[in-house]
Interface confidence: medium
């Protein structure tokens, strides 16, 4: 029987800068029941606080609700593992909520083949930002990537759309069925997961771009 091994805070994520969750990996348990507690303080403070919510994020997590989340302050946090034989501490992790935002995927991806009379045909797609993200406040700049591939192809073709919520693609293989997905990323944060695939059939008379 031994004191617990050193835990590790391995991930912190926020869906929208208003709340966030951190997760830790336990170390070895030393063969005894082990209790874990996460403590934190904010930049410029020395007063330590305990995790406000160990439930919402699931096992080995700490969730910070709206009233505990400050956007402009760095959080300094640590996990303490304790059993009857002693304690061990994780390394401290510094968390700035601005940097850990991982939004939900964009919504309402629609894809259409456009065949204007006077120009070459193209694939046109548009989407909406995730609902949890409020772009009107100016706190967020969301960047978008699109990827697409013929249904049976192995490789994706990826395009960067910047801040646009619509995009055109000219060079496509006629007669092929394409999968299209979009994802988003705040300027300082993480890419979202890809949206569910939208399928589009390219007509056989689609003229390839020269």
């Amino acid at each position: 029987q031994l004191p617990p091994g050193k835990p590790e805070i391995f991930k912190c994520r926020s869906p929208n800068k208003e709340t966030f969750t951190c997760w830790w990996r336990p170390g070895t348990d030393g063969g005894l029941p082990t209790n874990y507690s996460l403590t934190y303080h904010r930049e410029g403070e020395t007063l330590m606080h305990e995790c406000p919510d160990y439930i919402t994020g699931g096992p080995n997590s700490c969730h910070f609700g709206k009233q505990y989340t400050s956007m402009w302050r760095t959080y300094v946090m640590m996990v303490n593992a304790t059993n009857q034989m002693g304690s061990s501490f994780s390394d401290e992790l510094y968390v700035d909520v601005t940097y850990i935002v991982q939004p939900d995927p964009p919504l309402e991806l629609t894809v259409e083949v456009k065949q204007p009379e006077d120009r070459k045909p193209y694939l046109w797609m548009k989407w909406s930002p995730p609902t949890l993200i409020d772009l009107k406040t100016g706190w967020f700049t969301l960047l978008y990537e699109i990827r697409l591939k013929p249904e049976k192809a192995a490789e994706w073709e990826t395009h960067f759309a910047g801040q646009q919520t619509e995009f055109k693609i000219l060079s496509l293989h006629p007669g092929q069925k394409y999968l299209v997905q979009v994802r988003c990323k705040p300027d300082h944060g993480y890419w979202s997961a890809w949206s569910p695939a939208t399928f589009i059939q390219i007509p056989s008379d689609f003229i390839m771009n020269d």
Epitope: F10, V76, D91, E92, L93, Y94, D96, Y99, I100, Y190
Partner: antibody, heavy 120, light 113 residues
């Protein structure tokens, strides 16, 4: 106002011992990691050692491991560096540096330095 | 150990000019847990201790003029002075605090012509 005042430097022969001190004021000393960084004359900066709030957490550069010991006395707001088996290549200005938090990163305040000269 | 390499070693620039100093780490210092780059920039003037300018690769220390900015991620970082002033003559160092031993770049000496 944060102040860090190093002392204890001087001339010492190779193989000798010195104990550097750093008196801290203007902040809650016990809440922050502290480090020693040195600079040989005309050269760049070299991290030497750090100590976290939990005094058992100490870290050393390979070049000083086994010869230097960092410690702190939170009741006296003082950081120490005990330097044994000194070599000519240890000659440098030794700076005491405060980290932002209780473990180590970005040294936000530095002392003026104390000069250690190892020579026969 | 993580090796930090700065370029150039020295730089002579006109007053008011935009100035950039580069720093490359031998391995990534971006931590996936918090999306932070564990990199700092310091300024050292002759006869004085270093002064922290930038931490987390891009966060300006309080009191540092806003002509100083940091950028980059992973292994490649840049310190930019948007309009060089006479008081910016100094040696500039980058430092990684991702892993011990914490290591510094060799320094970039900035002078005015």
């Amino acid at each position: 106002e944060v102040q860090l005042l190093e002392s204890g430097g001087g001339l010492v022969q190779p193989g000798g011992t010195l104990r550097l001190s750093c008196a801290a004021s203007g902040f809650t000393f016990s809440a922050y990691a502290m480090s020693w960084v040195r600079q040989a004359p005309g050269k760049g900066l070299e991290w030497v050692s750090s100590i976290n709030v939990r005094a058992g957490d100490t870290y050393y550069a390979d070049s000083v491991k086994g010869r230097f010991t960092i410690s702190r006395d939170n009741s006296k707001n003082t950081l120490f560096l005990l330097m044994n088996s000194l070599r000519a290549e240890d000659t440098a200005a030794y700076y005491c540096a405060k980290a932002r938090y209780s473990s180590n990163w970005g040294f936000d305040f530095w002392g003026q330095g104390t000069l250690v000269t190892v020579s026969s | 150990d993580i090796v930090m390499t700065q370029s150039p070693d020295s730089l002579t620039v006109s007053l008011g000019a935009r100035t950039t100093i580069n720093c490359q780490s031998s391995q990534t210092i971006l931590h996936s847990s918090n999306n932070h780059n564990y990199l700092a920039w310091y300024q050292q003037k002759p006869g004085l201790p270093p002064k922290l300018l930038i931490y987390w690769s891009s966060t300006r220390e309080s009191g540092v003029p806003d002509r100083f900015s940091g950028s980059g991620s992973g292994t490649d970082f840049t310190l930019t002075i948007s309009s060089l002033q006479a008081e910016d003559v100094a040696i500039y160092y980058c430092q990684q605090y991702s892993n011990t031993p914490y290591t510094f770049g060799q320094g970039t000496k900035l002078e005015i012509n």
